[in-house]
């Protein structure tokens, strides 16, 4: 009579994290009598998994009726798989005696643990940055097995080149994180662009997960400002507008100095938006001409998300009859409350 | 293919610990035995221990006392520190990766590292 | 803890010629499986020790066929059908059924 063979037809098996596992081994004779015992690992230091004579295997059952005198199938079910499971499992037949002896091995069984990546976080800098500048935001992922995984990065569709990636460990483990820092040039048009990180992994089939974060949380675009004079309302006043334009984010507080003194401080409220996110919002003066005997010099300064102020200035000459004109100036911090001025803003 | 190298200091002084490292390169810790074995001069080869990939070890008795080995899976690197040294534990220390599959024995000490020479001097 | 002995100590060898090691364990390395775990190793001078046989008869991979491992029990036997230059070196017995692994003390190959 031939020699009884154990037969682990599989040589691997890969399972999703919490599904079940079945390690399938027949033997080829019912002699020797003895049971079987299925282990994890080979040699000293191999871990019993399963033993059809005695024991309490909670996460173990046998697919078919081991009990019964002529089954020769041992196959086992592991539940609730986790990465921690991975290892190559033997199902090894023992000779009955006192105490049973080891009698053959299967050629042994690779299970490996397919677990998902969580979904990816990406997060940018810490402070806003300008147009130009160039900014990095890092996407991570964890817990996922194998370690095999690609993850690419995109900018409104459009894929980014300038990122570095890692994988830890670099050894062995039941489960994986991916760390990437990408990157990316801000525009003056990046208030309404997305940095996506996308991750792709042998677990999701072909449907990669993504994790997004917005530009605007990102970007600082300064505002150009426009200061005018308009046509006269009255024979004793003139209109100034100061025009602020493409500017984010909204936080914004303006000030009108007269030669240098505060006149009206005001904080951008009912603003206009753009196209591309950014803002536009108007500030006015109307300045009583009369009541001063020398040019006046008129600057509109704006304070912008914390920022250094930035200003514009315009000369109002009031020997003459007021016409539109304009300057540039530097910026001035000088403050007193001035009469004889009034503003407004839209 | 597989390579294993050993590194630590090659002088270590009587009564202090003897630390090695050795690092596997190009392959994987899972389903083997990564184990130490020492040389000393002109004489034949002795079985220091091992570590199994699930973290059981195993010491030669005759050392068991002064001898830990641990695995760092992470970094793919396996470890031997060796407490109270003495001139008798000068010797090339050798880290070895060791095959089983075939039961309850071993398969044979497939890779070895190149030998890092450790002499106990004061 | 299992006892290695090697014989003989140095083996003076001709090139071309067979050779024969031969190792003993103070108990049997057959375990109820059908394997008997007995490795065999050459160290050439130099350099670190190189797998040849494991399980008593089975050449490790890249192991030249003119070495061959027989034996079962406690004594087993290593064979060189022709011995060649590179051949030179220390070899080793070493049992692998149960730790303490224990090595033989060495037999010296060199050429005559």
């Known amino acids: 009579e031939e020699e009884l063979q154990v037969i682990q037809p599989d040589k691997s098996v890969s399972v999703a994290a919490g599904e079940s596992a079945i390690l399938h081994c027949t033997v080829t004779s019912l002699i020797p009598v003895g049971p079987i015992q299925w282990f994890r690992g080979a040699g000293p230091a191999r871990e019993l998994i399963y033993n059809q004579k005695e024991g309490h295997f909670p996460r173990v059952t046998t697919v078919s009726e081991s009990t019964k005198r002529e089954n020769m199938d041992f196959s086992i079910s592991i539940s609730n798989i986790t990465p921690a499971d991975a290892g190559t499992y033997y199902c090894v037949k023992f000779r009955k005696g006192s105490p049973d002896t080891e009698f053959k091995s299967g050629a042994g069984t690779e299970l490996s643990v397919r677990a998902k990546p969580s979904a990816p976080v990406v997060s940018g800098p810490a402070a806003r940055a300008t147009p130009q500048h160039t900014v990095s935001f890092t996407c991570e992922s964890h817990g996922f097995s194998p370690r095999d995984i690609t993850l690419k990065w995109f900018k409104n569709g459009n894929e980014l080149s300038d990122f570095q990636t890692n994988v830890d460990p670099v050894g062995e483990s039941v489960s994986y994180s991916i760390h990437s820092t990408a990157k990316v040039v801000l525009t003056r048009e990046d208030v309404h662009s997305q940095v996506i990180c996308e991750v792709a992994h042998v677990t999701l089939q072909g449907d990669p997960l993504r994790g997004t974060a917005n530009l605007s949380e990102t970007i600082r675009v300064p505002p150009t400002l426009e200061v005018t004079q308009q046509p006269v309302r009255a024979e004793n006043q003139v209109n100034v507008t100061c025009q602020v334009r493409k500017f984010y984010p909204q936080r914004l507080q303006l000030t009108w100095l007269e030669n240098g003194n505060v006149s009206r401080t005001e904080t951008a409220s009912t603003v206009t938006e753009n196209k591309d996110g950014t803002y536009n919002w108007m500030s006015w003066l109307l300045v009583n001409v009369s009541a001063h005997r020398d040019d006046v010099k008129l600057t509109c300064q704006v304070e912008h998300d914390g920022q250094p102020a930035v200003s514009k200035s315009h000369d109002l000459k009031v020997s003459a009859h007021p016409k539109e004109q304009g300057s540039n100036t530097a910026a001035e911090n000088t403050g007193s409350n001035e009469r004889n001025i009034y503003g407004g803003s839209g | 293919q597989v390579q294993l190298q050993e590194s630590g200091p090659g002088l270590v002084r009587p009564s202090e610990t003897l630390s090695l490292t050795c690092t596997v390169s190009g392959g994987s810790i899972r389903n083997y035995y990564w184990s130490w074995i020492r040389q000393p001069p002109g004489k034949g080869l002795e079985w220091i221990g091992f570590?199994?990939?699930?973290?059981?070890?195993f010491y030669n008795p005759s050392l068991k006392s002064r001898v830990t080995i641990s695995l760092d899976k992470s970094k793919n690197q396996f470890s031997l520190k060796m407490t109270s040294v003495t001139a008798a534990d000068t010797a090339v220390y050798y880290c070895a990766r060791v095959r089983a599959y075939s039961g309850i024995g071993l398969d044979g000490t497939d890779v070895w590292g190149q030998g890092t020479t450790v002499t106990v001097s004061s | 803890d299992i006892v290695m002995t090697q014989s003989p100590l140095s083996l003076p060898v001709t090139p071309g010629e067979p050779a024969s090691i031969s190792c003993k364990s103070s108990?049997?390395?057959?375990?109820?499986?059908?394997?008997?775990?007995l490795d065999w190793y050459l160290q050439r001078p130099g350099q670190s020790p190189q797998l040849l046989i494991y399980?008593?008869?089975n050449r490790a991979s890249g192991v030249p066929d003119r070495f061959s491992g027989s034996g079962s029990g406690t004594d087993f036997t290593l064979k060189i059908s022709r011995v060649e230059a590179e051949d030179v070196g220390v070899y080793y017995c070493?049992?692998?059924?149960?730790?303490?692994?224990?090595f033989g003390g060495g037999t010296k190959v060199e050429i005559k």
């Open positions: 070493m049992q692998a059924l149960q730790t303490p692994l224990t």
């Open positions: 399980l008593g008869s």
């Open positions: 108990q049997s390395l057959l375990y109820s499986n059908g394997y008997a775990y």
């Open positions: 570590i199994y990939y699930n973290g059981r070890t």
